[in-house]
Each structure stands twice: as C-alpha cells, then as structure tokens.
C-alpha cells in the first residue's frame, strides 16, 4: 500500500504581496501524474477553481488578471493523481496593497538619531485601524505587527527602538490594516530614512517591548474627538 | 489609474435641490475618504463635507449642515453630493476629490452647477 | 475656522526666472505629535480641476516635477517654482488639513511676464 500522496507546492508570481489593479498567476506544482488541479480558497466555496495540468502535467496555472479584495486570502491547492487526490498544500497568502489610503510614517524626535539613543517611528492613518505594520527596506519579513487588543481602532501606532544601534538604520515603511481581514493593507507609507551617527555599536540590537497606545495629545489634528480609544496595541514581532 | 467621474451640468430654479454624482475607478473605492469641494465663478475653493464609502460616514462643513447630503452606492462605486434649498450663491463648480491623508490627490473634473429664476 | 491667506493675489513672473508664493495661517498648522506641518499646495489651471503639487508642506506629490518645492513650518509656507515654465500659468492654492472644516487660501493667478 503506497503512502498519501505527496502534498503540491503553492506559490505566486511575482509575489505573494500585490497592488490593486495588477496582475498575479498562482502556480501549484504537483507530480507528472497529476490529472486534475484544484485551487481552494479559505473561507470560500470549495473548490475555488480548478485547472488542467500544463504539459508535462506537473503544475497548473490560475491567473488573476486585476487584483481585487476578492481575491486577497489563504490558499491552498491539492492535485488529483490516478490514485486520488493528494495532501493540501502549505497556505499560501495573497495579501493586497492599496485597499486604504497610504499612512504617514515619523521618527520622534527626529530621524537623525545618535547611536545609544531613542527613537520612536510613528504611523498614522487616515482612518482608524486596528492593525499596523512596520517594514524596513531589504528585511525578509515585517519587522513588526501591532495590533490592538478588543479590535479597538486606532489613528496610529508607535514603534520605539531603543537603545538605536547601526543596525537600526535604513528605509522604513509602514501600512495599515483593519482586523476584518488581515490579507488587505493600505498603500505603503512614502519612505522614512531613520540615520544613525554615533560610535556606540551592538550587532544584535534588542527591540523595545513596551506597549503603545494610539492616544495622541490634545492638539493631534483631525483626529476625531471619541473616535479613539485609549486602549493599547499588542505587539507581535515577527 | 484613479479617475473620478462626475455627472453633467445642471441647471436649477432657486429653492430646489440638485444631486451630482461621482463615479469611481481606478482603485480600491470603499477604503478612500470622498469630499465635496465647491467654487464660485471666478473664486476660490471652499469644502463641503465628506463621506467615507466603507462605512457611510460623513461630516459636513457647518456653513453647508442641513442642506447637503452625501450618500454612497458600493455597487456602482459611485458617491452622491445633493445639496437643497438651492439659492442664486450655490451657483458654482462642485468638485468631488478623494482624500489622502486629509489633502487630496485626485479631483473629477467638476460639475457646473447654475441657480437661477 | 483656520483662516489661510495667500500672497500676493497675483504674480506675474518672466519664463525661466524664480516664482513664490506666500501662504500664511491663523494657527500653528505644525503637529507636535509627529512634527509634521499639514499644510497642502494645489495647482489649477483654466478649465481644469485643481491638482495636488506638494503635501505635508514640502512633499512632492508623486509625477510633479522638481521644480516645484514646498517650504516653511508653523504659520509661514512658501510654494517656490525654481524655473518658470509656460505651462505653469494657473492659479495656486494652499490649504491646511490641520483641523476641520478644511480651509483653502484665496489663490495666487501667476502669469508670464
């Protein structure tokens, strides 16, 4: 009795992160004996859609030609072999930009900043948020999620670094995102170069893990006036 | 890319109400605030209120408060601007601009509006 | 109500030369909870809807071009065109988002020389 088959790989070109309005082809990739594909996506009904191997029958194509908030999600596709259907395989998710106005990024107080010293990047958005994102430029991964804790909504969120080393240093953005479905974010914020001067080094700098609130003070302009709660944001580092 | 495009030019007898539409496209409508920005002939830009298409949330500028009223349909990608109680002073080009962060970054193309007996 | 006033009403300037536009408001439009000053600079010309130049007061808006720059803080902006161009006859208005309702300057008219 031969084992379960093999589960497919999943991917998407050319990336998993995509604008609205622009194109993106997900390939699943099985075996050569594989008859059928089929695409499902979480939350939606099975299967999502299916598709005929490509020659030689180890992949399948599925094209969405403009991106929109439908197809933002996690996906999964499985291969139908002449002995059945295979493993899932690992989640893929298709994360949309553009679905809310771009945030604005800040470094308090300032964005030059000398080695051994504070630095909080702040972002704010237009609408409030229950979810912000910090990326630095080059980095593999989001270098940090906050989101808040009841699903309250926040204009803003802070990122302090401290103490800022070397490392620190960079092209920082960040997005926004609200709770209902973490697949969509906002535009990216316009670029925030954070410089570090100074002789103080650390190669491995441990990031702050104080708790932000989005609470802005008196004079924090167009900020609604009850529409923020006081409440805090949970970090998740990544 | 964004485009917002608004109806055509009315004309209107004082005392009645006008209702201008803009349709978006381009974008992502439902995560974009939606404003209403008026001008005169011949004048300078005063605004109106906004809406924000997810929700149905607005706020209206004081001086405009209980003659407009901003309404959004999600299935056209469309928002409404109507105004009543029209006198001879609404006589303007009104804009319809999507908000960025408070500033706008694209605007439709205006629609004239003429009060007039 | 933020009051914005602009100056000087209009402007004319000679093709290649330096143009600026003055814009002041009745309050601080700068934030101290991000150090940035909300302030906006749009371009209109004849028959056209007006179009964003400069956010954040001296922010270029993305395809505008580099001779175009914003500047200032607090109460006192300048919009500066570094080289004037014929294409840059339009009316210029500043406008803060610092507070609602949103305000707009009266306009500067800048014509060639």
């Known amino acids: 009795q031969a084992g379960p088959l093999p589960k497919p790989t999943l991917w998407a070109e050319p990336g998993s992160v995509i604008s609205w309005g622009n194109s993106v082809t997900i390939w699943c990739q099985g075996t050569l004996e594989a008859r059928e594909y089929r695409l499902d996506k979480e939350e939606s009904p099975a299967p999502w859609d299916r598709q005929n191997p490509l020659e030689p029958k180890n992949k399948a194509r599925f094209s969405i030609p403009s991106m929109t908030e439908d197809y933002a999600g996690r996906y999964r596709c499985y291969y139908r072999s002449p002995v059945g259907w295979s493993q899932p395989s690992d989640p893929l998710e298709l994360v949309m930009t553009g679905a809310y106005s771009k945030p604005t990024l800040s470094a308090l107080p300032s964005p030059l900043v000398t080695s051994g010293k504070s630095v909080t990047l702040l972002c704010q958005s237009r609408s409030p948020m229950d979810t912000f994102l910090l990326i630095k430029e080059r980095a593999a991964h989001p270098l940090l999620h906050l989101r808040s804790e009841h699903g309250a909504q926040q204009h803003q969120a802070e990122f302090p670094m401290s103490p800022v080393t070397s490392v620190h240093g960079g092209t920082y953005r960040c997005f926004s995102s609200h709770g209902f479905s973490h697949y969509l974010l906002s535009h990216p914020s316009d670029p925030l170069e954070l410089i570090v001067s100074g002789s103080l080094e650390d190669p491995r700098p441990s990031p702050t893990r104080s708790v932000s609130t989005a609470a802005g003070p008196e004079d924090q302009p167009l900020m609604p006036t009850g529409s923020v709660p006081h409440s805090g944001l949970r970090r998740h580092w990544e | 890319q964004v485009q917002l495009v608004q109806s055509g030019a009315e004309v209107k007898k004082p005392g009645a109400s006008v209702k201008v539409s803009c349709k978006a496209s381009?974008?992502?409508?439902?995560?974009?605030?939606i404003d209403w920005v008026k001008q005169p002939p011949g004048k300078g830009l005063e605004w109106i209120g906004y809406i924000f298409p997810s929700n149905g949330e607005t706020s209206y500028n004081q001086k405009f408060k209980g003659r407009v009223t901003m309404t959004v349909d999600k299935s056209t990608s469309t928002v409404y601007m109507e105004l009543s109680s029209l006198r001879s002073e609404d006589t303007a080009v009104y804009y319809c601009?999507?908000?960025?962060?408070?500033?706008?970054?694209?605007w439709g193309q205006g629609t004239t509006v003429t009060v007039s007996s | 109500d933020i009051v914005m006033t602009q100056s000087p009403d209009s402007l004319a300037v000679s093709l290649g030369e330096r143009a600026t536009i003055n814009c002041k408001s009745s309050?601080?439009?700068?934030?101290?909870?991000?150090?940035?000053?909300?302030l906006a600079w749009y371009q209109q010309k004849p028959g056209q809807a007006p179009r964003l130049l400069i956010y954040?007061?001296?922010t270029r808006e993305s395809g505008v071009p580099d001779r175009f720059a914003g500047s200032g803080s607090g109460t006192d902006f300048t919009l500066t065109i570094s080289s004037l161009q014929a294409e840059d006859v339009a009316v210029y208005y500043c406008?803060?988002?610092?507070?609602?309702?949103?305000?707009f300057g009266q306009g500067t008219k800048l014509e060639i020389k």
């Open positions: 601009a999507r908000q960025a962060f408070y500033y706008f970054d694209s």
């Open positions: 406008q803060q988002y610092y507070s609602y309702p949103l305000t």
């Open positions: 309050q601080s439009l700068l934030s101290s909870s991000n150090q940035k000053n909300y």
């Open positions: 381009g974008y992502s409508f439902t995560g974009f605030y």
């Open positions: 954040w007061a001296s």
